[in-house]
């Protein structure tokens, strides 16, 4: 009885676990356990695609790179058709590549939550991370993710990270920029005139603030009056009356921050 069949194959790999480090060598051997009729061609496939110029029963991979990780098998054909071996999963291990940081979300509004993710290709996966804010290490932050539940203005800046696995430590990538937006801070209404203010005087007030992001674009004043604003953040009250008791200003960007009112204490002329 002459039963024709495609080649039956066995694949062997050195090292046997098919786990190697970048720069190591790997040898795969294809053995034909039976073939009827006799086999005619041999080829090797990686991730289902045929490898060019690999037509012998031994596949030698010298100084492997991480790109050579994948599923390998050999294919041997006879007149009946092709036979394929089982797949061998070759894992090329390497130290982490330079990392990148992803920020969810920037710009962030003060008080909102922000999450940072450190991304670095590595095999095996990184086991430890070091985080930096404006080049300074963030103590205790050793995980892939950093979660800040309520962001503050001074959290703004460049975040970078370094990933580490058993093969080594990666390099710090360029990092990502966090922009934190917030209302104007420490707004004050300042009376520019010498005291005391007398009825009929011209009073100049300025609206000052400590910092803001984005920049202050306008100012508001309470109470509203037919007063002159000679420049941004400056109010001029001509011929002040004794009933002009208190004035407050607000500095505004995307939000308005109000100062505490100031008393003019206008004295009778």
């Amino acid at each position: 009885l002459n039963v024709k069949h495609t080649p039956k194959l066995e694949i062997k790999v050195t090292p046997s676990d098919a786990i190697v480090r970048e720069g190591d060598s790997v040898t795969m051997t294809c053995e034909v356990s039976s073939s009827n009729p006799e086999y005619t061609t041999v080829s090797w496939l990686k991730d289902g695609t045929s490898l060019k110029k690999q037509n012998t029963f031994t596949l030698n991979l010298r100084e492997v790179t991480k790109d050579q990780s994948g599923k390998y098998c050999c294919q041997v054909s006879n007149d009946v058709g092709p036979g394929r071996s089982e797949e061998v999963f070759l894992q090329v291990q390497y130290a982490p590549e330079p990392s990148t940081v992803q920020i969810l979300h920037s710009p962030a509004v003060e008080g909102s939550q922000v999450e940072f993710l450190c991304m670095s290709l590595a095999n095996p996966l990184p086991t430890n991370y070091t985080w930096y804010h404006n080049g300074k290490e963030m103590q205790g932050r050793t995980e892939e993710k950093v979660h800040i539940p309520k962001i503050l203005p001074w959290h703004a800046g460049t975040y970078s990270c370094v990933a580490e696995n058993i093969l080594g430590t990666g390099q710090r990538g360029p990092g990502a920029e966090l922009d934190v937006q917030y209302p104007p801070k420490k707004v004050t209404t300042v009376i520019q005139n010498p005291m005391p203010i007398r009825e009929g005087d011209t009073v100049t007030l300025s609206c000052n603030y400590n910092s803001s992001n984005p920049s202050v674009t306008r100012y508001e004043w309470k109470p509203h009056g037919a007063w002159e604003e000679p420049s941004l953040g400056v109010l001029k009250i001509q011929n002040v009356g004794w009933d002009n008791t208190t004035i407050a200003c607000a500095a505004c960007n995307s939000w308005c921050s109000w100062a505490s009112p100031v008393a003019l204490n206008v004295q009778y002329a």
Epitope: G111, Q139, R141, H147
Partner: antibody, heavy 124, light 107 residues
Amino acid sequence: QVTLKESGPGILQPSQTLSLTCTFSGFSLSTSGMGVGWIRQPSGKGLEWLTNIWWDDDKNYNPSLKNRLTISKDTSINQAFLKITNVDTADTATYYCARIAHYFDGYYYVMDVWGQGTSVTVSS
Amino acid sequence: DIQMTQSPASLSASLGETVSIECLASGGISNDLAWYQQKSGKSPQLLIYAASRLQDGVPSRFSGSGSGTRYSLKISGMQSEDEADYFCQQSYKYPYTFGGGTKLELK
């Protein structure tokens, strides 16, 4: 020196509203990065977080009690308040308030200083 | 909610002995973990924050370690004043949750 002190009614009846006050000193709830949290502990049992209030008036509640809790603050007198509606005997516990501070070394928020606690008994 | 499972529930140790308490989170908490000590009739006191950072004024015999979901508190050389309840607490996700506590007694 940071201190917090809780005050409350001591005893109240089921279905009533529990009102608690946390009076603090040594920090301001108008400072960025500051918060106050409420935590309770039934006698001989573990701790249960209830709610937080932050410098920007943001509030967080424990979902298991959310529809019964209201947290508020008055920054001008350095006080935080907690109201629990429709109390039951299961609300009998020691209630603590704690400062939540931003720790600059790793950007953590930590309940770092706690009040002495106030005992609340719900009984008919 | 993230569940915090603390073990053991109780233990007794001799003076000078090294003691470890474990805390297992039901999900990753990125080192957002604190340890508190609560002496009888008193309020909790912060010992460790950020999993391993020692709070100012806390004796150096206390140390914290761990990452991901597994964390531990170690007391290197038990002292009589360490007799207390110990709690872990995560602040990674709302609601904040505490471990069930560990009662540490002096042998």
